[in-house]
């Protein structure tokens, strides 16, 4: 008799999930020799242990602690780039500006980037059919809890000037409900972080508005200021030129505003 299976509203676990996580771990340690001490099989076992046989709406940060411990990594605390709704450009930036790091440039962020996963209560099976959706099903699902956990730890580690890249094309440039707005902003440590500098990325070629005056940016400034952290904001009018100038800062066209 086929066992009844819970149908969730979100997509199921990414195909080849175990193989992908293990392969990514091996790749990461090849690319980052300073992480060679990491045993990738143990990392996978800890990852699996966080959600397998557990109800996918009842996952806690505690479930991920063994994985967090294995994935402990020191990144330069003054070289952290946060982002919200503009992941690709943030990653293109750290690919060029090698001394800066997004969460996905760390081992744990790299392992899980763009993946979905969940298990089922009391069975060792991975659910490839469906997983809980944050809005429609539950917020304490394996993926959401993972990102909340690693995002909190990443923000807590930051110091000095922290940068955040924001998408100026969205109706809410700063969204209180995003991971940045709901987790990272509130976990920056005022005793370590001097300034949060927002880079607002413009989408339109002819968009010359000062998006740093946007009401949602003012809201961000207010939240940050109340936490005794200074706030600054820059418009990036030409993201393509911005990246080009990061690559070739000596280019004569890079002295003008980008």
């Amino acid at each position: 008799v086929p066992r009844w299976r819970q149908q969730w509203s979100g997509p199921g676990t990414t195909k080849r999930f175990p193989e992908t996580v293990l392969a990514r771990c091996v790749k990461y340690t090849e690319i980052h020799p300073e992480m060679r001490h990491v045993d990738c099989q143990s990392v996978w076992d800890a990852f699996k242990g966080a959600f397998i046989s557990k109800h996918p709406c009842n996952i806690t940060e505690e479930d991920y602690q063994p994985l967090m411990k294995l994935g402990t990594q020191t990144v330069p605390c003054n070289k952290i780039l946060l982002w919200s709704r503009i992941k690709d450009l943030a990653h293109q930036f750290t690919q060029v500006q090698r001394d800066m790091f997004t969460l996905e440039d760390t081992l744990l962020g790299y392992l899980a980037d763009d993946l979905t996963w969940c298990g089922e209560f009391n069975t060792s099976k991975i659910n490839y059919q469906s997983c809980p959706d944050w809005r429609k099903d539950c917020s304490n699902n394996p993926v959401s809890v993972f990102w909340k956990t690693v995002s909190r730890r990443f923000a807590e580690a930051a110091c000095d000037v922290v940068h955040v890249m924001l998408n100026g094309s969205r109706s809410k440039i700063f969204d209180k409900n995003s991971t940045f707005g709901s987790v990272e902003v509130h976990n920056l440590q005022p005793e370590k972080v001097q300034t949060l500098e927002a880079w607002v990325i413009h989408g339109g070629r002819e968009d010359s508005r000062d998006l740093c005056q946007d009401p949602t940016i003012k809201e961000l400034e207010s939240i940050i200021s109340k936490r005794n952290i200074q706030f600054s904001c820059k418009n990036i009018y030409r993201p393509d030129k911005f990246l080009q100038c990061v690559k070739n800062p000596e280019d004569s066209s890079c002295t003008s505003e980008i």
Epitope: R16, E19, T20, A23, R24, V26, K27, T29, E30, I31, P33, R36, H91, Q95
Partner: antibody, heavy 120, light 107 residues
Framework: EVQLVQSGAEVKKPGATVKISCKVS????????MNWVQQGPGKGLEWMGW????????DVAEKFQGRVTITADTSTDTAYMELSSLRSEDTAVYYC?????????????WGQGTTVTVSS | DIQMTQSPSSLSASVGDRVTITCKAS??????VDWYQQKPGKAPKLLIY???NRYTGVPSRFSGSGSGTDFTFTISSLQPEDIATYYC?????????FGGGTKVEIK
């Protein structure tokens, strides 16, 4: 069986650009980093750089920066190495290579090599 | 970059002889040294990884040892098919760097 099959020999003029391909089979292309290695005639081996095909992230040895572009096409499971502004000292055999699961960080898998001759 | 100084650059030995090649790293590379064999017109072939681990299918006459900065590669009993150039490579830090190679010939 893991296989890395490279494109054929090339003869180029100084100042030109060459693009070598490395088509893989026998494993999931995005699961491994692809490296490129140069070997001049009668010379030793020199690591040029790598690409993570899953994300397109690359790293190129300082000696080759500005002239080498490494790319990957996940739809065809092929990695590419492009070398521009060719000069006579770029005459060499170029290899793609990757690590394996039971080989530490050594390269058990190599392409057969592509000979590039730069001559006016 | 880490320099890998390999010696000798060439050697000639008789079949059955014990052959030893050394590689010295300019700084500590832990055990992250691999040894390759390359025959003319062919791609290099991995023999030893992580200083002392024989890769799958590699005959037991090939061995490696060392850690830190000093590494040794040994062929316990040289065979005619071992005629080749041997390279060490450090895989501890980017960029990976190779030794200059040792050409092994039969007397």
């Amino acid at each position: 069986e893991v296989q890395l099959v490279q494109s054929g020999a090339e003869v180029k003029k100084p100042g030109a650009t060459v693009k070598i391909s490395c088509k893989v089979s026998g494993y999931t292309f995005t699961d491994s980093v692809m490296n490129w290695v140069q070997q001049g005639p009668g010379k030793g081996l020199e690591w040029m750089g790598w690409i993570d095909p899953e994300y397109g992230r690359t790293d190129v040895a300082e000696k080759f920066q500005g002239r080498v572009t490494i790319t990957a096409d996940t739809s065809t499971d092929t990695a590419y190495m492009e070398l521009s502004s060719l000069r006579s000292e770029d005459t060499a055999v170029y290899y793609c290579a990757r690590t394996g699961y039971n080989s530490g960080y050594g390269f058990p898998y190599w392409g057969q090599g592509t000979t590039v001759t730069v001559s006016s | 970059d880490i320099q890998m100084t390999q010696s000798p650059s060439s050697l000639s030995a008789s079949v059955g002889d014990r052959v030893t090649i050394t590689c010295k790293a300019s700084q500590n590379v832990d055990s992250d040294v691999d040894w390759y064999q390359q025959k003319p017109g062919k791609a290099p072939k991995l023999l030893i990884y992580k200083a002392s681990n024989r890769y799958t299918g590699v005959p037991s006459r090939f061995s490696g040892s060392g850690s830190g900065t000093d590494f040794t590669f040994t062929i316990s009993s040289l065979q005619p098919e071992d005629i080749a150039t041997y390279y060490c490579m450090q895989s501890n830090t980017h960029p990976r760097t190779f030794g200059g190679g040792t050409k092994v010939e039969i007397k």
